[in-house]
């Protein structure tokens, strides 16, 4: 083979028969070179007599090798370990769509061995994002959804939601969403959802912030029941009542709409007035009785009182001595059924 | 009181086209998201597509894409699914659903493709 | 996309059994599943949601809980309405639903 300087490495190497084939310990892993810092990728073998790397089918340079040997302990078998850089230039200069790979070979005297392919990217991170959140005005209890399309980048970035600076965490607060495309989906906007929300795209190299997108959640207000009417405007007659209800079951909060409709309501009334009782003429007196008295009543009937009228004042009753308080009257003329009664006589 | 009524099922040939509707009560759905999921007899469920109309957002099922379209009528409160080149697999209940919880379903049409 | 494995599917139980149900899903899907109940005939209905939230007016002998990418729907007493087919769903990426399980009567 040829290395990238020019220089000859052997297809086999020589090594004491009859050991087994090489055995990978450790094996380079996928990196990513981040700004301009180099990848290591590092290799151990066992039993190896010699260990290299190859990048995309090159022999990497011998001088690009840092080699360690040591003995394992148990079989006495030589452990082989390796090392080399990769620099961003290098992956750079890889024209075509393939990545840039390595990987080791190992040789014993039984033959070799390769150890899986490690691809080497040069990560980075994109300004932009393909998708932002936008602003979202909802009304309580409504579902929400916020998209978000992170950068393109190398690794592909991670994403999470802030919540007015906060991180989200759907395991924490279950009314909160996040699905394998970023979207943020509240399953039922509350008052305290009202925040700004953005969405933050990071990877190795770079984290990115998007536009902040604002979500109000608004109450649109509510009529409380109606009011009792309102005693007649006027006592006595046709008049106007009304009643009221409020905007306030619920209020509109963070800008939702007014109640539609009236707040007051009027309508005709008419009391029936009110007519004081007043008394009727005083009857005759009555026949002087036993007790040498005669009587006279009325009634309040003229008219009686009606719709709450005021009763009328005074007595039903009058009473007078008939005889000038001479009281010396004949007893016969008194227990005789056959003497005429009394005239009820005037004023 | 939310109610989702779905309809527009029937027997159609392999290659027709079907309008599925599902019309909504009790519920704003411009502020939801509303979705198709269907049952073929005796299987299990499996999701068709969704929509949610404030933020112009639509997903279909991969068994789906290319042959069906959701979409939402606001003003009328109903969202469809027009269903062209119809094979006989996609023969099945199929129910709207309201949000990502898929809280409220409708009852179901029958969508019977065959010759 | 998503596979979400149910087990069993299906298991006979008494009234009064504790039943389990349990649903992998093949990657992780934070705490986005849901289970639901199916009676033939009818549309599924809502039981858990965001894998351990129960539904309002569903009643607390349901209860859902996550491990990692397991998933688990327990019944702690059977009542005779409760025999019917379950399904649990991944909201995380593209919908999708496990098999089902039917529990029926012993």
């Known amino acids: 083979g040829i290395d990238s300087g020019g220089q000859a490495l052997p297809d086999s190497f020589p090594s004491a028969p009859a050991e087994q084939l090489p055995h990978f310990l450790l094996e380079p892993e996928d990196a990513y070179i981040v700004k301009n810092k180099p990848v290591e990728l590092h290799c151990r073998a066992f039993p190896a007599t010699q260990i290299y790397f190859k990048c995309n089918g090159e022999w990497v340079s011998q001088k690009g090798h840092v080699t360690q040997e040591s003995l394992d302990e148990a079989t006495g078998l030589r452990i082989r370990e390796v090392q080399i850089e990769v620099s961003r230039q290098q992956v750079e200069e890889l024209f075509g769509l393939e990545d840039y790979w390595c990987q080791c070979v190992a040789w014993s005297s039984s033959g070799t061995t390769k150890s899986r392919r490690a691809y080497i990217r040069i990560a980075y991170l994109r300004k932009n994002f393909d998708q932002e959140p936008l602003a979202k005005e909802v009304p309580l209890d409504h579902e929400v959804l916020l998209q978000c399309r992170p950068p393109e980048g190398v690794p592909v970035a991670e994403v999470e939601w802030l919540k007015n600076e906060d991180v989200i965490d759907p395991a924490q607060d279950t009314n909160f969403l996040l699905t394998i495309d970023h979207n943020l989906i509240i399953r039922q906007a509350r008052l305290s959802d009202t925040a700004n929300y953005t969405c933050v795209a990071k990877n190795i190299v770079a984290k990115r912030r998007s536009t902040t997108a604002t979500v109000i959640v608004y109450v649109n207000g509510g009529w409380s029941s109606w009011a009792e009417w309102s005693p007649c405007s006027n006592r006595c007659g046709r008049g106007w009542q009304k009643r009221t209800r409020t905007c306030t079951n619920p209020a509109p909060l963070n800008g939702g709409a007014f109640c539609e409709g009236q707040a007051c309501q009027k309508t005709a009334c008419t009391t029936v007035c009110p007519v004081d009782g007043a008394w009727t003429e005083w009857s005759k007196w009555s026949a002087c009785s036993t007790e040498c008295a005669h009587w006279r009543s009325r009634e309040c009937m003229a008219p009686p009182p009606q719709n709450g009228g005021r009763d009328c004042s005074g007595t039903l009753l009058d009473s007078k001595n008939c005889t000038d308080g001479l009281c010396v009257l004949n007893q016969r003329t008194l227990n005789d059924p056959k003497s005429r009664p009394l005239e009820p006589s005037g004023d | 009181e939310v109610q989702l009524v779905e309809s527009g099922g029937g027997l159609v040939q392999p290659g027709g086209s079907l309008r599925l509707s599902c019309a909504a009560s009790g519920f704003n759905l411009y502020y939801y998201s509303m979705h198709w999921v269907r049952q073929a007899p005796g299987k299990g469920l499996e999701w068709v597509a969704s929509i949610y109309s404030y933020s112009s957002y639509t997903s279909y099922a991969d068994s789906v894409k290319g042959r069906f379209t959701i979409s939402a009528d606001t003003s009328k409160n109903t969202a469809y699914l027009q269903m062209n080149s119809l094979r006989a697999e996609d023969t099945a209940v199929y129910y709207c659903?309201?949000?990502?919880?898929?809280?409220?379903w409708g009852q179901g049409t029958l969508v019977t493709v065959s010759s | 996309d998503i596979q979400m494995t149910q087990s069993p599917s299906s298991l006979s139980a008494s009234v009064g059994d504790r039943v389990t149900i349990t649903c992998r899903a093949s990657q992780s899907v934070s705490s986005a599943v849901a289970w639901y109940q199916q009676k033939p005939g009818k549309a599924p209905k809502l039981l858990i949601y965001?894998?351990?939230s129960l539904y309002s007016g569903v009643p607390s002998r349901f209860s859902g809980s996550r491990s990692g990418t397991d998933f688990t729907l327990t019944i702690s007493s059977l009542q005779p309405e409760d025999f019917a087919t379950y399904y649990c769903?991944?909201?995380?990426?593209?919908?999708?639903f496990g098999q089902g399980t039917k529990v029926e009567i012993k």
């Open positions: 659903a309201r949000s990502y919880a898929m809280d409220y």
């Open positions: 965001s894998a351990s």
């Open positions: 769903q991944q909201s995380y990426g593209p919908f999708t």
